[in-house]
């Protein structure tokens, strides 16, 4: 066992001479992004104050390619890197095409309405006039491709012109536009060469030791790893913590059960019920508030102030009133909960599926005519699963090195 331990320690660290270095640099696991849209069935009725009715469409599946660049080894046992992602639509794995039309809330209009609720009435009336002039409505009918990667909207230019610096989009607006062909920030992580106990843990993200999106030091902490590998020699008492640039926060997953993936022993880690709980149910989350119902996290502070919320799909594990407020939602543990299966000896993921939902809080706002009589509701826009499983040559090598070899050496 000590020989095995030495081998593991030698080969998991981030070092060009270690066996796992290339695996860390160019993740050989095929990752897929599966996106499910909530097609709004009754937009006109919602504007009259009726309950929203949605139909889940999808999956629209994309192969996700990741590669690290600008890899720089620092002299404090850390390495800095940028990781770029590109997405390629997979028609054969998808239920529909990127040219499918989806009726969705117009995030720019309804988001701006809620953001301006407490602004002077005059400003809201000016926005109403601007929306009318530009032909903007509360709901839009756009293709999957447009929603994902961006569509030209005169409102984007208007926002950039009259509210400069507020908006990260320049010409087009798309929910995943910022992710494609771009990096998720400069990560600086510990290599484990000098101190294995800190391997993969994030030292800094974009040069920051903590973020300032939230209202408490605890919520602003950058904890855990960058979400791809963890320190070796895990136990059932270990937790799986990582910083997610997309959620603008650190997340902690808990051990659920032991299992086996393609002959390799694994630990399954899942989201605790408290992950998106509000501050009154789970006080450490108070820093993420102001909160609505429990089970959804307000990410407006890191998403151009738009009233966007992150949760489990179909409001799984959230306050039941959220799913009850929208017809067509059916939360299901099996289908909608996220998991990561980790090989505990190395801290390397074997099989994972991270599932999250993005929703928009919308309501009627006096002075903004486009919002009609919309009753306040958190309306799901889409949910996605980012999934990957080790396979092929990589799996064979891993199995040989970490399962067969130790068995042979044991005898």
């Amino acid at each position: 066992p000590s020989l095995i331990k030495q081998q593991v320690l030698k080969n998991v660290r981030i070092d060009p001479s270690s066996l796992s270095f290339n695996m860390w640099k160019e993740i050989p696991i095929p990752f897929y992004l599966s996106v499910y849209f909530f097609d709004v069935m009754n937009p006109s009725e919602i504007l009259k104050g009726e309950k929203p009715q949605v139909r889940e469409r999808g999956p629209y599946v994309y192969r996700e390619f990741r590669h690290k660049s600008n890899i720089t080894f620092n002299n404090n046992d850390t390495v800095s890197f940028l990781e770029y992602r590109t997405f390629q639509f997979q028609p054969s794995k998808s239920h529909g095409s990127e040219s499918d039309y989806i009726v969705m809330p117009n995030i720019l209009v309804l988001g701006a309405a809620v953001m301006m609720e407490n602004k002077p009435m005059t400003l809201k009336l000016i926005m109403t006039l601007a929306f009318t002039t530009l032909g903007e409505r509360a709901f839009m009918n756009r293709t999957v491709g447009e929603i994902m990667w961006g569509y030209k909207d005169p409102l984007v230019n208007l926002i950039n012109k009259y509210f400069p610096g507020m908006f990260p989009f320049k010409d087009k607006f798309g929910l995943f536009a910022e992710l494609n062909n771009s990096d998720s920030g400069l990560f600086t992580v510990f290599t484990g060469v000098q101190n294995i106990s800190r391997i993969h843990l994030v030292d800094k993200w974009n040069g920051l030791s903590k973020v300032d999106f939230w209202h408490s030091d605890q919520c602003n902490m950058i904890n855990g790893t960058s979400g791809q590998m963890w320190p070796p020699f895990m136990t059932p008492e270990s937790s799986l913590e990582f910083y997610s640039p997309e959620a603008c926060r650190s997340m902690k997953l808990m051990y659920k059960e032991s299992g086996v993936f393609e002959g390799i022993p694994t630990y399954r880690f899942v989201a605790p019920k408290t992950l998106f709980a509000n501050g009154s149910i789970y006080p450490p989350n108070e820093g993420f508030c102001p909160c609505l119902e429990s089970g959804i996290q307000n990410v407006s502070t890191c998403r151009f102030s738009a009233p966007l919320f992150l949760s489990h799909p179909h409001f799984l594990n959230a306050d039941p009133v959220l799913a009850e407020a929208v017809t067509g939602l059916h939360p299901n543990q099996e289908a909608h909960s996220l998991f990561l299966d980790i090989h505990p000896v190395t801290g390397i993921p074997m099989n994972c599926s991270v599932k999250l939902q993005l929703s928009l809080y919308m309501k009627s706002v006096a002075g903004i005519g486009q919002t009609g009589k919309i009753e306040p509701v958190v309306l799901p826009l889409l949910w996605f699963a980012e999934s990957g499983a080790m396979e092929g040559e990589t799996l064979h090598t891993f199995y040989t090195q970490l399962v067969l070899m130790p068995k042979v050496m044991h005898y």
């Epitope: 602004k119 002077p120 005059t122 009336l125 000016i126 006039l129 601007a130 009259y162 400069p164």
Partner: antibody
Framework: QLQLQESGPGLVRPSETLSLTCNVS????????WSWIRQSPGKGLEWIGN???????DYSPSLKSRLRMSVDTSTNQFSLRLSSVTAADTAVYFC??????????WGQGTLVTVSS | QSVLTQPPSASGTPGQRVTISCSGS????????VNWYQQLPGTAPKLLIY???QRPSGVPDRFSGSKSGTSASLAISGLQSEDEADYFC???????????FGGGTKLTVL
């Protein structure tokens, strides 16, 4: 060509009501927001309030209790009524068109003197 | 008393560059965009700069605006005699909930 023209009495007695009308030509009054701004002699500009064609108003907090604005879409005019005036209300009163850009078009202004 | 503070006067000789400042707070300039108005003697004000630094058509590019934090400034380069006027900054204010103006700066071309 958009034009705004203020009209109303140039002299108002203290404690009485100041009434002004702004005639809008060259554009429908329903297309924008309309404002009143005043400038006391030798002083800066002071925003009075805005009105939307539907009648929704937004008043300066300091004048709110004495102010009433109205709009008449049939004549393409909007009006201002300021009650219980004092010498401090003596000013040049401008009507203006308000867009996202700001006060984009102005009338030439009308001087209202409050004096007995 | 104006909520936005401007120097009462400024001056320069033809061809010079002059800057006029406008300072406010987080409830106005800090959370809004700034407009600048020019008022030539005996006339109504005219929109000169909107959204901090945008010029309406017809305004010469000698006029430029900028904003940083809770302050804004108007710069006039290549000063000309016809630039002699009063200049006012304006912004939305969230606390009194309306439009506020600066006290105005009288620009003299020497």
């Amino acid at each position: 060509q958009l034009q705004l023209q203020e009209s109303g009495p140039g002299l108002v007695r203290p404690s009485e009501t100041l009434s002004l009308t702004c005639n809008v030509s060259g554009v429908s009054i329903s297309d924008d927001l309309w404002s009143w701004i005043r400038q006391s002699p030798g002083k800066g500009l002071e925003w009075i309030g805005n009105i939307y064609y539907s009648g929704i108003t937004d008043y300066s907090p300091s004048l709110k209790s004495r102010l009433r604005m109205s709009v008449d879409t049939s004549t393409n005019q909007f009006s201002l009524r300021l009650s219980s005036v004092t010498a401090a209300d003596t000013a040049v009163y401008f009507c203006a068109r308000l867009t996202l850009r700001g006060f984009q078009n102005w009338g030439q202004g009308t001087l209202v003197t409050v004096s007995s | 008393q104006s909520v936005l503070t401007q120097p009462p006067s400024a001056s320069g000789t033809p061809g010079q560059r002059v800057t006029i400042s406008c300072s406010g707070s987080s409830s106005n300039i800090g959370s809004s965009t700034v407009n600048w108005y020019q008022q030539l003697p005996g006339t109504a004000p005219k929109l000169l700069i909107y959204s901090n630094n945008q010029r309406p058509s017809g305004v010469p590019d000698r006029f430029s605006g900028s904003k940083s934090g809770t302050s804004a400034s108007l710069a006039i380069s290549g000063l000309q005699s016809e630039d002699e006027a009063d200049y006012f900054c304006a912004a939305w204010d969230d606390s009194p909930n309306g439009v506020i103006f600066g006290g105005g700066t009288k620009l003299t071309v020497l």
